[in-house]
C-alpha cells in the first residue's frame, strides 16, 4: 500500500507519458490522477513502467472502479493485465472479441494462466455460447483450449464452430470430450464428399460409434493406425475382421505392432482365430476354431 502524500510542486501529471518512469512509487500515487489514467490507458503499454510502478497504476484504477473496470479501460490494459487477479477479472464484463484478443496477446507464448482462464470464462459466459470467431481466437492462442473444457461446457459449442478446430486442438482431449464433439463434427461436415469428409472428421473419431466406423469401412478411407488406436474400445469391438481390414486398408499391417495394446488387444480377443489368420499378420489370441461365442449382453436384452 502506498502512503498518501502530497504531490511535489511541478510534478502533477498532465498526461500519461514516459516522464512518469522516473517517478517514485509515492509520486505516481500522489501525482497521477486516476481519471486521467483511465482515459489515457492506451499509452500505458508503450511506456516501460517497472512492475512495481504498474502496481501503483493498478491500485489507482481499483480505487476509481471498485465494481470492476469498464471495457474501454480493459481493452487497453496491456501489461497491466498481468497484474490482475482472477478476483479482479470476475468483476469485468468483456463483450468485445477485440478486447479478448488484446489481452490474450499480452500473455502470448505462456501457459494459460488463472487470469486468462477466468477472462475466457467471463467472455464465453457473456456470449452464451462458444461461437466460431471466439473459438478461432482461443485455439489460435491456446491450441489445447478445447480439451480444457468439460463435456458440459463443450455442449454449448455450435456445430458451425467446429470448422475452426484444427487436429492439434484435439490432441489432449479425452474420450468423454470427443463423445460430445464428434456428433457436432459429423453434423458440421455432413455435406462433404467421402475423402474430404474423412480428412475433416478424422481428428474427432475418438467419439465415433460402431455404426459410423462400419460406414467408413465401406468408403476406402485407409485410416492410419494412430487414428485407429484412439477409437473407443466399445466402438471397435463389434467390428469384423473384414471391416477392420477395409477401414485400415494398407495400414492393416500395423495391427501386429499394436496387438498388445487397446483397442487392438481387446478386439483380437473377440475375433475368431480363423478370421484373424486371413489377414496373414500372425495375430494371436482370437477365439479358437470350434468354440461357440455367447453374447451375454444380447441374451440379457432378450430376456
Amino acid at each position: 500500500e502506498v502512503e498518501k502524500t502530497a504531490c511535489p510542486s511541478g510534478k502533477k501529471a498532465r498526461e500519461i507519458d514516459e516522464s512518469l518512469i522516473f517517478y517514485k512509487k509515492w509520486e505516481l500515487e500522489a501525482c497521477v490522477d486516476a481519471a486521467l489514467l483511465a482515459t489515457q490507458m492506451d499509452r500505458v503499454n508503450a511506456i516501460p513502467f517497472t512492475y512495481e510502478q504498474l502496481d501503483v497504476l493498478k491500485h489507482k484504477l481499483d480505487e476509481l472502479y471498485p465494481q470492476g473496470y469498464p471495457e474501454s479501460v480493459i481493452q487497453h490494459l496491456g501489461y497491466l493485465f498481468l497484474k490482475m487477479s482472477p478476483e479482479d477479472i470476475r468483476k469485468w464484463n468483456v463483450t468485445s472479441l477485440e478486447t479478448l484478443k488484446a489481452l490474450l496477446e499480452v500473455n502470448k507464448g505462456h501457459e494459460m494462466s488463472p487470469q486468462v482462464a477466468t477472462l475466457i470464462d467471463r467472455f464465453v459466459k457473456g456470449r452464451g455460447q462458444l461461437d466460431k470467431d471466439t473459438l478461432d481466437t482461443l485455439t489460435a492462442f491456446y491450441p489445447g483450449y478445447l480439451c480444457s473444457l468439460s463435456p458440459e461446457e463443450l455442449s454449448s459449442v455450435p456445430p458451425s464452430s467446429i470448422w475452426a478446430v484444427r487436429p492439434q486442438d484435439l490432441d489432449t482431449c479425452d474420450p468423454r470430450q470427443l463423445d460430445v464433439l464428434y456428433p457436432k463434427a459429423r453434423l458440421a461436415f455432413q455435406n462433404m464428399n467421402g475423402s474430404e469428409y474423412f480428412v475433416k472428421i478424422q481428428s474427432f473419431l475418438g467419439g465415433a460409434p460402431t455404426e459410423d466406423l462400419k460406414a467408413l469401412s465401406q468408403q476406402n478411407v485407409s485410416m492410419d493406425l494412430a487414428t485407429f488406436m484412439k477409437l473407443r474400445t466399445d466402438a471397435v469391438l463389434p467390428l469384423t475382421v473384414a471391416e477392420v481390414q477395409k477401414l485400415l486398408g494398407p495400414h492393416v499391417e500395423g495391427l501386429k505392432a499394436e496387438e498388445r495394446h487397446r483397442p487392438v488387444r481387446d478386439w483380437i480377443l473377440r475375433q475368431r482365430q480363423d478370421d484373424l489368420d486371413t489377414l496373414g499378420l500372425g495375430l494371436q489370441g482370437g477365439i479358437p476354431n470350434g468354440y461357440l461365442v455367447l453374447d451375454l449382453s444380447m441374451q440379457e436384452a432378450l430376456s
Epitope: 507519458d17 514516459e18 516522464s19 518512469i21 522516473f22 517514485k24 512509487k25 508503450a46 516501460p48 513502467f49 517497472t50 512492475y51 512495481e52 501489461y79
Partner: nanobody
Framework: EVQLVESGGGLVQPGGSLRLSCAAS????????MGWFRQAPGKGRELVAA????????YYPDSVEGRFTISRDNAKRMVYLQMNSLRAEDTAVYYC?????????????????????WGQGTQVTVSS
C-alpha cells in the same frame, strides 16, 4: 549484446564545464532509458541524469539540477552529459548505462538496479 563506450572525461577547474559522450553499439533496438551514474572513491554509484530513449524525457536529482543536462541522438545512438558549474564534489568516475528490459526493482530507473548494460567509465576530476 550492447557495448557502451564513454569519452570526454578529464581534469577541470571548479566552475568549469565538461561534455561527456556515450556511444552505444551492438544490438540495435530502442532502449527504455539511458543514464549517467557516478562513483566517487569509497562511495556507491549514484544516478546524476537519465533520459527516456523514445520521448527524450529527463530526470535529474537535486544535487545536479540546473547544472547538468542529458541529451541523446537516436540516429547516432549517442548520449551526452553536459556538466556546467563543476564543483570539487563532482569528482568521480562517470558511467554510462542502458536500461533495456522491463524491470522489477523499486524506483528502478533511479538507481543502478534498473540498468543492465554499463560502460567502463571515464574519470572526471574537478580541482584547482
Amino acid at each position: 549484446e550492447v557495448q557502451l563506450v564513454e569519452s570526454g572525461g578529464g581534469l577541470v577547474q571548479p566552475g568549469g564545464s565538461l561534455r561527456l559522450s556515450c556511444a552505444a553499439s551492438g544490438r540495435t533496438f530502442s532502449y527504455n532509458a539511458m543514464g549517467w551514474f557516478r562513483q566517487a572513491p569509497g562511495k556507491g554509484r549514484e544516478l546524476v541524469a537519465a533520459i527516456t530513449w523514445r520521448g527524450g524525457y529527463t530526470y535529474y536529482p537535486d544535487s545536479v539540477e540546473g547544472r547538468f543536462t542529458i541529451s541523446r541522438d537516436n540516429a547516432k545512438r549517442m548520449v551526452y552529459l553536459q556538466m556546467n558549474s563543476l564543483r570539487a564534489e563532482d569528482t568521480a568516475v562517470y558511467y554510462c548505462a542502458a536500461a533495456t528490459a522491463r524491470v522489477y526493482a523499486d524506483d528502478s530507473y533511479l538507481n543502478e538496479s534498473g540498468y543492465d548494460y554499463w560502460g567502463q567509465g571515464t574519470q572526471v576530476t574537478v580541482s584547482s
